[in-house]
Interface confidence: low
Amino acid sequence: CKAMHVAQPAVVLASSRGIASFVCEYASPGKATEVRVTVLRQADSQVTEVCAATYMMGNELTFLDDSICTGTSSGNQVNLTIQGLRAMDTGLYICKVELMYPPPYYLGIGNGTQIYVIDPEPCPDSDF
């Protein structure tokens, strides 16, 4: 396995609508035509897969229809957006990038982006 550097922001604050976006950038060691991006969530020493997409360079990322993730790619950057987040989803979101084709296979794992999610305050009861 060939190691590859992956960079991502240290901290991101989700919007009041529970949406968080961040850029995952990888240092491609060569010409890659097929790339797989996986978002992992680490919380309480547990790591779970949030979403994953394989894309051909120059094409859009395609996540599963029921995925909470969307994304776009531009060169060696992937712009990831995670939706539907709640306070309980606060945690470290790790970007894993695999250059699937052509060989040799490269794997890169970022240090993670700490996403803070604050549930919005409920609206006060109105008298009118």
Epitope: C1, K2, Y101, P102, P103, Y105
Partner: antibody, heavy 120, light 107 residues
Framework: EVQLVQSGAVLVKPGASVKVSCKAS????????MNWVRQRPGKGLEWIGM????????SLNQAFKDKVTITADESTSTAYMQLSSLRSEDTAVYYC?????????????WGQGTTVTVSS | DIQMTQSPSSLSASVGDRVTITCRPS??????LAWYQQKPGKAPKLLLY???NLADGVPSRFSGSGSGTDYTLTISSLQPEDFATYYC?????????FGQGTKLEIK
Amino acid sequence: EVQLVQSGAVLVKPGASVKVSCKASGYSFTTYWMNWVRQRPGKGLEWIGMIHPSDSETSLNQAFKDKVTITADESTSTAYMQLSSLRSEDTAVYYCARMGRRNPYYFDYWGQGTTVTVSS
Amino acid sequence: DIQMTQSPSSLSASVGDRVTITCRPSENLYTNLAWYQQKPGKAPKLLLYGATNLADGVPSRFSGSGSGTDYTLTISSLQPEDFATYYCQHLWGTPFTFGQGTKLEIK
């Protein structure tokens, strides 16, 4: 039907060069890596290197870097391997082999082999 | 470079026997391993890829297993046409080295 057809057997003198061809048909030549493999008489298989015909990017086994040049002609869907400064130990059967496009990889189609005999 | 140690180098067996060939790479291949069959005077033929996936048209008596640094090719019931030489190959970064081969002969 995918086919890889290699050039015929050759007898060459020590010190000479030879160019072996591999004509591909039945698939999109520019979207697959083409590999070359050596098999000396009675011995095993050795990976020489590969070329991606779309832009002629090559990856070569360092053990063959001073011996082999790999090229490809997109217009004729043909891959070539040139062997230089031939010696008796270069006597072998040389195969071309297509590599599958997705991970996990494999060599799915092979040419019939070209016998190169180096002798004075 | 990754070294591929294949064993045994030769093997005598009878029709109907169950045969196992082992391949041990010098480092973890993460199942990026293929098996080929070669008969005298012929090009190698793909049997399995990704350690366990049967190639198109290959009989189900052939199977592959393993992970990490330990891989196995099994022929559940030898047929006359199975007597040949078998090679493993890693495809985990270049150079894509092969095992030294296992020659399967009739007992």
